[in-house]
């Protein structure tokens, strides 16, 4: 998929965590087809 | 040691293509996002997007994104952003650089200068 | 978009002096923002991330301090090897952006 940023704010800011998409891990493989 | 090794300088006339490569060693190449940056001569730092090594998964700088296309390969460790519709203000340095999510852009490619030219 | 401004822009110093560099920020990035320093002709190199931790292999001289919108990197004592240009960064939120820079140069 794809994300186009540059427009509004993003939701994480409430949280105390960086708000940018953690290291990727095997468990976010997507499921094949 | 962590290392990226990206492709060589090019020159390219308006309205063409450029595909630069990175080609990673030294880590888990699907263990971080693979961003790119790039710098016009003498001015500052333009992240343009970056691409999830194990989905694909891409985000892209919305200034970028109708003309941008970042792939990978992990049975070759590289990654490969291609700019598409080349312009005179196209003329930059581009760097791949790994994002790790605690330190960001830890690691950095050496650049690849883009001459966009008539 | 977050906007970064540094400053100054330019500065000039001595070997053995203490320089400071401020970046604040257009909203809150809470501790996430990084510095880099380059050099003429070489890639960025990661200083400092999360406001104030020293990525590896980077001296102790060079300090990072600040949540929120402002920030400081400080280096305690200038050596000829740290006359460069210093990037901030945000790694808070997308897209990620970048300060203008600040050029530290030989007084």
């Known amino acids: 998929s794809e994300t186009t940023t540059g427009t509004s704010s993003n939701s994480s800011q409430s949280t105390s965590n960086s708000g940018l998409a953690p290291n990727p891990t095997n468990a976010t493989t997507k499921a094949a087809g | 040691q962590v290392q990226l090794v990206q492709s060589g300088a090019e020159v390219k006339k308006p309205g063409a293509s450029v595909k630069v490569s990175c080609k990673a060693s030294?880590?888990?190449?699907?263990?971080?996002?693979m961003g790119w940056v790039r710098q016009a001569p003498g001015q500052g730092l333009e992240w343009m997007g970056e691409?999830?090594?194990?989905?694909?998964?891409?985000t892209f700088n919305q200034k970028f994104k109708s003309r941008v296309t970042m792939t990978r390969d992990t049975s070759i460790s590289t990654a490969y952003m291609e700019l598409s519709r080349l312009r005179s203000d196209d003329t930059a340095v581009y760097y791949c650089?790994?994002?790790?999510?605690?330190?960001?852009?830890?690691?950095w490619g050496q650049g690849t200068t883009v001459t966009v030219s008539s | 978009d977050i906007q970064l401004t540094q400053s100054p822009s330019f500065l000039s110093a001595s070997v053995g002096d203490r320089v400071t560099i401020t970046c604040r920020a257009s909203?809150?990035?809470?501790?996430?923002l990084a510095w880099y320093q380059q050099k003429p002709g070489k890639a960025p190199k990661l200083l400092i991330y999360?406001?104030?931790t020293l990525h590896s292999g980077i001296p102790s001289r060079f300090r990072g301090s600040g949540s929120g919108t402002e920030f400081t990197l400080t280096i305690s004592s200038l050596q000829p090897e740290d006359f460069a240009t210093y990037y901030c960064?945000?790694?808070?939120?997308?897209?990620?952006?970048f300060g203008q820079g600040t050029k530290l140069e030989i007084k």
């Open positions: 650089a790994r994002r790790d999510y605690g330190t960001s852009l830890d690691y």
């Open positions: 030294g880590y888990d190449f699907t263990g971080y996002h």
């Open positions: 691409i999830n090594p194990i989905t694909s998964d891409k």
């Open positions: 909203k809150s990035i809470k501790k996430y």
């Open positions: 999360a406001g104030s």
């Open positions: 960064q945000q790694h808070n939120e997308y897209p990620i952006t």
